[in-house]
């Protein structure tokens, strides 16, 4: 099959790093400077991505693979293949159209990116707040209030041993 395919389409023989050159009777030509083809059988080479401005080069372009970019300090990648750079904020902040803003009371953000999220509602799990939340940290939930009532023990006593043949009452 491979031999049949290559007889039908000479371009299928062109390896990565080359293109099938129509100007040269479909012979394989190496990719021109600052371009690449990462797979065989290509009819053109793609222009290398250039990491400019807020982008910086993480991996140089070669004749067989594109450049890879990341973001300069103070920014982080968004999108597939770091297609955008977004400004970092401090912990306890979120990025809005007007820049970095502190998290509203009752919300937190423990990262330099993303949005402020509501504190955990401990009471939904029947628990109490052990450590209060801040703009940078979620609350820490502790035992339920009932567990902390006077005389209550946090240690569960062992179940009484059962005698064989007796069913529980």
């Amino acid at each position: 099959f491979e031999r049949t395919r290559s007889l039908q389409d000479p371009c299928s023989n062109c390896p990565a790093g080359t293109f099938c050159d129509n100007n040269r009777n479909q012979i394989c030509s190496p990719c021109p400077p600052n371009s690449f083809s990462s797979a065989g059988g290509q009819r053109t080479c793609d222009i290398c991505r250039q990491c400019k401005g807020v982008f910086r080069t993480r991996k140089e372009c070669s004749s067989t693979s594109n450049a890879e970019c990341d973001c300069t300090p103070g920014f982080h990648c968004l999108g597939a293949g770091c297609s955008m750079c977004e400004q970092d904020c401090k912990q306890g902040q979120e990025l809005t159209k007007k820049g970095c803003k502190d998290c509203c009371f009752g919300t937190f953000n423990d990262q330099k990116r993303g949005i402020c999220r509501p504190w955990t509602n401990c009471s939904l799990d029947g628990k109490s707040v052990l450590v209060n939340g801040t703009k940078e940290r979620d609350v820490v939930c502790g035992p339920s209030p009932a567990d902390l009532s006077p005389g209550a023990s946090s240690v569960t006593p062992p179940a009484p041993a059962r005698e064989p043949g007796h069913s529980p009452q």
Partner: nanobody, 111 residues
Framework: AVQLVESGGGLVQPGGSLRLSCAAS????????MSWYRQAPGKQRDLVAW???????HYGDSAKGRFTISRDNTKKTWYLQMNSLKLEDTAVYYC?????WGQGTQVTVSS
């Protein structure tokens, strides 16, 4: 423009070796890519080996593990070292850079 002249071809037995040379003259600073092609009678010109613009050597399937492309900048010369030659390596070998082609050198592998 760049002028290219190949040499080093000849008759060799199967399993033998040859080293082809490609001497460049003219504006050789324009050379970013250098390639070796070969053309057997009645066949299409085939890319054998090349040094890409990123200075990495690449090889076509027919050359992998047997041929080595290299250059000597002081002599403005590119080489194709061909080992373990086979009957099917018989062809005219050309060096190429951009629109510049050499006149070709004949390699014949025969017992």
């Amino acid at each position: 423009a760049v002028q290219l002249v190949e040499s080093g071809g000849g008759l060799v037995q199967p399993g033998g070796s040859l080293r082809l040379s490609c001497a460049a003259s003219g504006n050789i600073f324009d050379i970013r890519i250098m390639s070796w092609y070969r053309q057997a009678p009645g066949k299409q010109r085939d890319l054998v080996a090349w040094i890409a613009w990123d200075n990495v050597a690449h090889y076509g399937d027919s050359a992998k593990g047997r041929f080595t492309i290299s250059r000597d900048n002081t002599k403005k010369t590119w080489y194709l070292q061909m080992n373990s030659l086979k009957l099917e390596d018989t062809a005219v070998y050309y060096c190429n850079s951009g629109d510049s082609w050499g006149q070709g050198t004949q390699v014949t592998v025969s017992s």
